[in-house]
Amino acid sequence: FERTRSLQDPCSNCPAGTFCDNNRNQICSPCPPNSFSSAGGQRTCDICRQCKGVFRTRKECSSTSNAECDCTPGFHCLGAGCSMCEQDCKQGQELTKKGCKDCCFGTFNDQKRGICRPWTNCSLDGKSVLVNGTKERDVVCGPSPADLSPGASSVTPPAPAREPGHSPQ
């Protein structure tokens, strides 16, 4: 019965970008400016999202799809569909109630967002620290101390991996 009724429903013929206008004998009318319908058979069009304030327009609204926002420089998106913007910090910092704060010793953050995470504990894998960690970078683990016995080949990291002022342990 439901299927039969939907086949007879004139609104089901209205494509995306239009709505079924009850005030005009259920004919398909185009969505008004600043509104859209992303599926067919809609009885109303939805208002387009406006990217204001800290939000920037990433994709303009069209008659068939909503606008998409991202965040102004210095901020990043949070939430589904970028529902919020959160300020960036520098690498080596995390955002707290008191603003951007440096990572505590023994932790690092290599991004402009997120929290400081503990350095890898190389000894848990039976390895040694090859390059010390910093606020911005995790430690680099090398071969286990046993592997570095005389005659064993040592692993040298590529030059860019070395942090200035930190020598391998």
């Epitope: 304030g53 800290v54 949070l78 939430g79 529902s83 919020m84 913007c85 959160e86 300020q87 955002l95 109630k97």
Partner: nanobody
């Protein structure tokens, strides 16, 4: 419609004071952290201060500590920023913003902004 409207900006001499206001409407003001940001000419947005829903927690960027005071009146749906001992480097457009759901628990995202009010500190 959810709206934030700032006022109170103007021209003031170094060492002077101003009080900025932000009138909120269209949402339950008392359920949100509120934040002040500023943008100096040619620079990016900078967080200035924020205040917990009931006003029990307040935090400031180091450069304004001891000079600026954030406050709110939930009965009047209003946010304030009292700015004393103003300096030339405080010259900026000041924006109030609403903390999004979960603000300060898992993140510090904001979702609604005002149009801004201009503060110029100059002799």
């Amino acid at each position: 419609e959810v709206q934030l409207v700032e006022s109170g900006g103007g021209l003031v001499q170094p060492g002077g004071s101003l009080r900025l206001s932000c009138a909120a409407s269209g949402f339950t003001f008392s359920s949100h952290w509120m934040t002040w940001f500023r943008q100096a000419p040619g620079k990016g947005l900078e967080w200035v201060a924020h205040i917990k829903e009931g006003g029990s927690e307040k935090y400031y960027v180091d450069s304004v500590k001891g000079r600026f005071t954030i406050s709110r009146d939930n009965a009047k749906n209003s946010l304030y920023l009292q700015m004393n001992s103003l300096r030339a480097e405080d010259t900026a457009v000041y924006y109030c913003a609403r903390g999004g759901d979960g603000y300060s628990d898992s993140h510090f995202g904001v979702d609604v902004w005002g149009q801004g009010t201009t503060v110029t500190v100059s002799s």
